[in-house]
Structures are given as structure tokens and as C-alpha cells.
């Protein structure tokens, strides 16, 4: 049995920040679980991890230098990424693992979310203002 994951197909990160919600076909509240977000088609970079245990506080961390936070719903985990760079535009995949109680469960690979990071562009004032009306 595999858990199904739903993600938005695409998100635009204005102001270099984005909320990515991973929706699962599974209630996480009475489980020990590890939810993670992975970058790239090969999911090579583990961007952020949310570790949950029903009796303890949520642990959120990144071992790859991303600024992230996480929030738990009963069938979802939302990753909040900040300080993203334009060159971190990529496809991001949600992963979920239920560690306890047994048996171990994980998800079918999702379609992923393309996060398009738009850098902050300041609009310069025009050098030559248009002709003034008399």
C-alpha cells in the first residue's frame, strides 16, 4: 500500500518565498512520520524535512542550506521556503514516510511542483520622461 500525494503543478515564488502544500491520502496525526521536500528531476537534493511524532513537537530542518519551515495538517504538510534564488527554479517533489507504528509506508512518486523563482526587480525611473503637455 502506497500513500498518494497531491501537489500544485506550478508555483511562482514572488519575493523569493513560497508555500508548497503536500496533500496526502493519509492521516498523519497518530503516526511517527518523516515528510521531506526534494529538488530536481532525480530528487537529488533534500531541501527540507519535517519530522513528526503525535506526542511531540514538530521538528523542521534543512541539511542543504535552505531556509524552510513546516506546518502539519491532519492530511498535509506545508513547506514554507524563503530566501530562494532565481537559479533554484526547479521541480520539487513531496515525499512521506510513515515510520511507526509498523509497517513502514511511503508514497507513490508525485508529479512534483515546478517552483519558478522570480527575483526582486526594482523598476528604474525612466531616463527620458515623456513630453510634458503644455
Amino acid at each position: 500500500n502506497k500513500i498518494l500525494v497531491k501537489q500544485s503543478p506550478m508555483l511562482v515564488a514572488y519575493d523569493n518565498a513560497v508555500n508548497l502544500s503536500c496533500k496526502y491520502s493519509y492521516n498523519l496525526f497518530s503516526r511517527e512520520f518523516r515528510a521531506s521536500l526534494h529538488k530536481g528531476l532525480d530528487s537529488a537534493v533534500e531541501v527540507c524535512v519535517v519530522y513528526g511524532n503525535y506526542s511531540q513537537q514538530l521538528q523542521v530542518y534543512s541539511k542543504t542550506g535552505f531556509n524552510c519551515d513546516g506546518k502539519l495538517g491532519n492530511e498535509s504538510v506545508t513547506f514554507y521556503l524563503q530566501n530562494l534564488y532565481v537559479n533554484q527554479t526547479d521541480i520539487y517533489f513531496c515525499k512521506i514516510e510513515v515510520m511507526y507504528p509498523p509497517p513502514y509506508l511511503d508514497n507513490e512518486k508525485s508529479n512534483g511542483t515546478i517552483i519558478h523563482v522570480k527575483g526582486k526587480h526594482l523598476c528604474p525611473s525612466p531616463l527620458f520622461p515623456g513630453p510634458s503637455k503644455p
Partner: antibody, heavy 121, light 107 residues
Framework: QVQLQQSGAELKKPGASVKVSCKAS????????IHWIKLRSGQGLEWIGW????????QYNAQFKGKATLTADKSSSTVYMELTGLTPEDSAVYFC??????????????WGQGTLVTVSA | DIQMTQSPSSLSASVGDRVTITCKTN??????LAWYQQKDGKSPQLLIY???HLVEGVPSRFSGSGSGTQYSLTISSLQPEDFGNYYC?????????FGGGTKLEIK
């Protein structure tokens, strides 16, 4: 279909031990937790503990630690509960039940028929 | 440990009556609750899981409701075959305690 077949009734003397068996069929034995429950005459259901044959994980109710020991034999798809140092208070019907995971919510949809253990001098 | 307080402990009702049994917990169990029916000498039968989900094959007169720390099982129109004992059980960690039970007798 899923079946849990328990061993027959037992009559034991105080201080003795008893081993109750629960033979599973109709599913992959190592993929499901088996719970054990006690029912004393005129009283309610008491949860004893669970055993996961896939990894031999066990959880006991603190009240039954030192009283009940859960084990399994994968080759025969059987889970066992041994009760030691029997007293008249251990006289009860003991049930095994399979835990199913309903998308993150647990319940016990499949039960054995029960094993009556009587402790009497 | 989670404490389960089930009430009433016994109940006598007539065929056709609407009956409600309640189960209270000392902390939020997030709907990780099941209801069982047990008749004398028989194994318990699962009626409801996840507080509100009716098991396939169980008559629709049975329903579960509640959230947080308060849950209930309702039989909308009592039938003669509904006599017996009813138990709630939580699955919010271990021990997976049962409620004390409700003995339902038909008048």
C-alpha cells in the same frame, strides 16, 4: 478471507503458565499487527498489547508487563501469548485481533473466536 | 495514558428507540477512535472506525460522531438484534484503552 484461529480452552492451577495461540490465514502474516485483548466475566475489554511479526516489534500495556509475553512463529503464521504466574484474576477469555490501517486511522476488524483460560486450584 | 470514560454503563430501551452512547477522553485523540459491538460468548465486531466511518456491511442505523475529546455512537432505530455490549477504543498511542462498556438491553 482473513481468519484468526485460536487454540482451545485451558484449565490451569494457580502459579502455572499457559500459552495461547492465534493462527492467521488469508493474508500476508508479516504485514499486519496482532493485538491481544482480555475479557473477564462481568467486566469490560482490556488491551494487553500488540505484536508485529514483520519486525518482531512489541508494545505492552504496562499492567500486563511481566504477566504476558508475545511471540510469533512466521513459518506457521502464528502469534502466541504466554501468561505466567497465573492467579484466579487471570481467568478470562483472551482474544487476538488484527489491526487494519484505514488511511492513518486504526481499528480491529478481524478477531479470533477467543480462548477461555480458567485458573482454579 | 489516555483515560476513556464511557456512559451510560447500562441502558434499557425499546425497539424503534433512538439510543446514544458516549465516550469521553482526557485529551484530544483526533478521531482515532473505534466502536465495537459484542454479544455474549462472541467476538467483538467493529462498527465504526475513525470516529465516524461506518464499516462495510454494518447497518446504516449505526452512526458515529464527535471530535477532540467527545465521541458518540448512535443507533437511530433500535432493532432486537442490537442488544449486547458496546465498547469504544482509542488508537492515540499505547495503551489502546477501551471504554468501560455499555450493556444495552431491549425492553
Amino acid at each position: 478471507q482473513v481468519q484468526l484461529q485460536q487454540s482451545g480452552a485451558e484449565l490451569k492451577k494457580p502459579g502455572a503458565s499457559v500459552k495461547v495461540s492465534c493462527k492467521a490465514s488469508g493474508y500476508t502474516f508479516t504485514e499486519y499487527i496482532i493485538h491481544w485483548i482480555k475479557l473477564r466475566s462481568g467486566q469490560g475489554l482490556e488491551w494487553i498489547g500488540w505484536f508485529y511479526p514483520g519486525s518482531n516489534d512489541i508494545q505492552y500495556n504496562a499492567q500486563f508487563k511481566g504477566k504476558a509475553t508475545l511471540t510469533a512463529d512466521k513459518s506457521s503464521s502464528t502469534v502466541y501469548m504466554e501468561l505466567t504466574g497465573l492467579t484466579p484474576e487471570d481467568s478470562a477469555v483472551y482474544f487476538c485481533a488484527r489491526r487494519d490501517d484505514f488511511s492513518g486511522y486504526d481499528a480491529l476488524p478481524y478477531w479470533g473466536q477467543g480462548t477461555l483460560v480458567t485458573v482454579s486450584a | 495514558d489516555i483515560q476513556m470514560t464511557q456512559s451510560p454503563s447500562s441502558l434499557s430501551a425499546s425497539v424503534g428507540d433512538r439510543v446514544t452512547i458516549t465516550c469521553k477522553t482526557n485529551e484530544n485523540i483526533y478521531s482515532n477512535l473505534a466502536w465495537y459491538q459484542q454479544k455474549d460468548g462472541k467476538s467483538p465486531q467493529l462498527l465504526i472506525y475513525a470516529a465516524t466511518h461506518l464499516v462495510e456491511g454494518v447497518p446504516s442505523r449505526f452512526s458515529g460522531s464527535g471530535s477532540g475529546t467527545q465521541y458518540s455512537l448512535t443507533i437511530s432505530s433500535l432493532q432486537p438484534e442490537d442488544f449486547g455490549n458496546y465498547y469504544c477504543q482509542h488508537f492515540w498511542g499505547t495503551p489502546c484503552t477501551f471504554g468501560g462498556g455499555t450493556k444495552l438491553e431491549i425492553k
